[in-house]
């Protein structure tokens, strides 16, 4: 349905509060270095303009597209050239090229200071002094650091952020009330950002078909009682929502997501029995709840798939008539029967089935050729099962920190060219799979673990894409979305790597380490471990363990010393010498 004024349409659909919040998110995700005040000014100008269009849709410029209006506004920023360099060249382009240009300049790892959490009393005062500015600042800071954050979901986070301050700033012990809530929001926010980043990478790097396949598999697991036609409709709508959000069309995305939630709730009887509670919630909570809803029970009586997909004489006829529909049905039928498989495994099985049909439907005797197609599934299923079993055993034996260290060593040896901060961040996140997934029963382990690993490895891929340093990473990241994890798992030690020169400065520590939180101290130690492996890639586990144990003892000893700085200086020299000797450097 065409509207005379798109901006007026979205303003009316979303309401002023959501409109302003979404425009702020959009601008902060595009111009990540701009000061908060500049963004607020731009948002206010856009909002005032939108209001004039609501009053009269025929008013001047109200018929312009949102990309044109927003792009024109962003291009009025005076310091664009000096702050963003070549991104300023985007402003010389016309839509839609200008928006594509802005999208290409989104930075997954912007050079922004770490967010430091002020004292609780300081935060509560700021919250009470100006609640609106305080919440806008939250949206701005998250959006600029996470330029692909799912905007309607960020509104949900902001709502929870506000609720936490409203409740806790009145509590007797403000800190005890607030800090755990903020920690939870931070951790959930990072996870949400990473999950959305994978969706956008899937759409942008591998195309709509790849995303739709992922969505068919996931929604079929979640809604196994829904008909294929219903799942297909949901997949189409969901693809539109994520295409819009990943493309910077945040107003349309939020509006369409609300429509999708409405549709799901109006049709829950034909979708899932698990939606009742979600559908009683307000909009933001409802959409979040639907996105996280547990899998419905499988229908009581699902036949074997062999009849339709192997034994039927019409397999090649059905495939030829509508390849993607037939493959979609295969994926739907397999996924609804297999909530115990990861989505990426289901997609590998579907790809194997597709490849077999492509080959066999051109053969002399197609049926004879594809009769044994599912024998090819067995190794594909067993590989992640075995990998998860081995790694969960290792995790249970070592605990999270040491399990992360094992992964740090493993991945540094595979791709030593990758920057140390990236290796530390990615390996720490890979290591979290243990506490996240190994506690689950076997039927839930694989979807938990392998789909989580896909999200984490995508972080490695997008960070590496910014400054590519390893052909092996590029190869694993670009060849196949669903085979990224097996590709990285299969990498052995990089024999072509020339060890890094030893630099004593890398292993010089100071008394400030003593005041760090346990997590930050772990990161320091893990950074040192990566550097050790880069210096001595052939070091054995035993050698590395000995050096790390010495390092831990050194930190503990000097943090207890009266003159900490002297201790770090003197004992540090001894430690470096001992480590060099132990590793034969």
């Amino acid at each position: 349905d065409a509207h005379k004024s798109e901006v007026a349409h979205r303003f009316k659909d979303l309401g002023e509060e959501n409109f302003k919040a979404l425009v702020l998110i959009a601008f902060a995700q595009y111009l990540q270095q701009c000061p908060f005040e500049d963004h607020v000014k731009l948002v206010n100008e856009v909002t005032e303009f939108a209001k004039t269009c609501v009053a009269d849709e025929s008013a001047e410029n109200c018929d312009k597209s949102l990309h044109t209006l927003f792009g024109d506004k962003l291009c009025t920023v005076a310091t664009l050239r000096e702050t963003y360099g070549e991104m300023a060249d985007c402003c010389a382009k016309q839509e839609p090229e200008r928006n594509e240009c802005f999208l290409q300049h989104k930075d997954d790892n912007p050079n922004l200071p770490r967010l430091v959490r002020p004292e609780v009393d300081v935060m509560c005062t700021a919250f009470h002094d100006n609640e609106e500015t305080f919440l806008k600042k939250y949206l701005y800071e998250i959006a600029r650091r996470h330029p692909y954050f799912y905007a309607p979901e960020l509104l949900f986070f902001a709502k929870r952020y506000k609720a936490a301050f409203t409740e806790c700033c009145q509590a007797a012990d403000k800190a005890a009330c607030l800090l755990p809530k903020l920690d939870e929001l931070r951790d959930e926010g990072k996870a949400s950002s990473a999950k959305q980043r994978l969706k956008c990478a899937s759409l942008q790097k591998f195309g709509e078909r790849a995303f739709k396949a992922w969505a068919v598999a996931r929604l079929s697991q979640r809604f196994p009682k829904a008909e294929f036609a219903e799942v297909s409709k949901l997949v189409t709508d969901l693809t539109k929502v994520h295409t819009e959000c990943c493309h910077g069309d945040l107003l349309e995305c939020a509006d369409d997501r609300a429509d999708l939630a409405k549709y799901i709730c109006e049709n829950q009887d034909s979708i899932s029995s698990k939606l009742k509670e979600c559908c009683e919630k307000p909009l933001l909570e409802k959409s979040h709840c639907i996105a996280e809803v547990e899998n419905d029970e499988m229908p009581a009586d699902l036949p074997s798939l062999a009849a339709d997909f192997v034994e039927s004489k019409d397999v090649c006829k059905n495939y030829a008539e509508a390849k993607d529909v037939f493959l979609g049905m295969f994926l739907y039928e397999y996924a609804r029967r297999h909530p115990d498989y990861s989505v990426v495994l289901l997609l590998r099985l579907a790809k194997t089935y597709e490849t077999t049909l492509e080959k066999c439907c051109a053969a002399a005797d197609p049926h004879e050729c594809y009769a044994k197609v599912f024998d090819e599934f067995k190794p594909l299923v067993e590989e992640p099962q075995n990998l998860i079993k081995q790694n969960c055993e290792l995790f249970e034996q070592l605990g999270e920190y040491k399990f992360q260290n094992a992964l740090l060593v493993r991945y540094t040896k595979k791709v030593p060219q990758v920057s140390t901060p990236t290796l530390v961040e990615v390996s720490r996140n890979l290591g979290k799979v243990g506490s996240k997934c190994c506690k689950h029963p076997e039927a839930k382990r694989m979807p938990c673990a392998e789909d989580y690993l896909s999200v984490v490895l995508n972080q490695l891929c997008v960070l590496h894409e910014k400054t590519p340093v390893s052909d092996r990473v590029t190869k694993c990241c670009t060849e196949s979305l669903v085979n990224r994890r097996p590709c990285f798992s299969a990498l052995e030690v990089d024999e072509t790597y020339v060890p890094k020169e030893f630099n004593a400065e890398t292993f010089t520590f100071h008394a400030d380490i003593c005041t760090l939180s346990e997590k930050e101290r772990q990161i320091k130690k893990q950074t040192a471990l990566v550097e050790l492996v880069k210096h001595k890639p052939k070091a054995t586990k035993e050698q590395l363990k000995a050096v790390m144990d010495d390092f831990a003892a050194f930190v503990e000893k000097c943090c207890k010393a009266d003159d900490k700085e002297t201790c770090f200086a003197e004992e540090g020299k001894k430690l470096v010498a001992a480590s060099q000797a132990a590793l034969g450097l």
């Epitope: 499988m298 009581a300 009586d301 699902l302 036949p303 074997s304 798939l305 062999a306 039928e333 397999y334 029967r337 297999h338 909530p339 115990d340 498989y341 599912f374 599934f377 067995k378 299923v381 067993e382 076997e442 039927a443």
Partner: nanobody, 124 residues
Framework: EVQLVESGGGVVQPGGSLRLSCAAS????????MGWFRRAPGKEREFVAA????????YYADSVKGRFTISRDNSKKTAYLQMNSLRPEDTALYYC?????????????????WGQGTLVTVSS
């Protein structure tokens, strides 16, 4: 957790019949596809028959179609394999299996729980 115990095996002449039973304890078997597999001496384990959760769908290996019938009684937590017109090549150790998420009924890796087996010998 499901424990499966097969019974009903024995020695029978060619052309004879046997009825195998698979009794489950632990979980309710109505959530599981039930299957029968067999392993003949010196051979790989092979699929025989399977039945969907409520019993509405059955699926057979070509070699037993028309001779064997699989059934189940969820209230008794038991699956059955009625074997008629038995042949010497049906001689094998017969295993019962339960699969929570089976899509391909004939694939052994899609079954989560297995019994110890019951021996069927067809000989004159």
């Amino acid at each position: 957790e499901v424990q499966l115990v097969e019974s009903g095996g024995g020695v029978v002449q060619p052309g004879g019949s046997l009825r195998l039973s698979c009794a489950a304890s632990g979980s309710n078997i109505s959530s599981y596809v039930m299957g029968w597999f067999r392993r003949a001496p010196g051979k790989e384990r092979e699929f025989v028959a399977a039945i969907s959760r409520s019993g509405g769908y059955t699926y057979y290996a070509d070699s037993v179609k028309g001779r064997f019938t699989i059934s189940r009684d969820n209230s008794k937590k038991t699956a059955y394999l009625q074997m008629n017109s038995l042949r010497p090549e049906d001689t094998a150790l017969y295993y019962c299996a339960a699969g929570r998420y089976s899509a391909w009924y004939s694939q052994s890796y899609e079954y989560d729980y297995w019994g110890q087996g019951t021996l069927v010998t067809v000989s004159s």
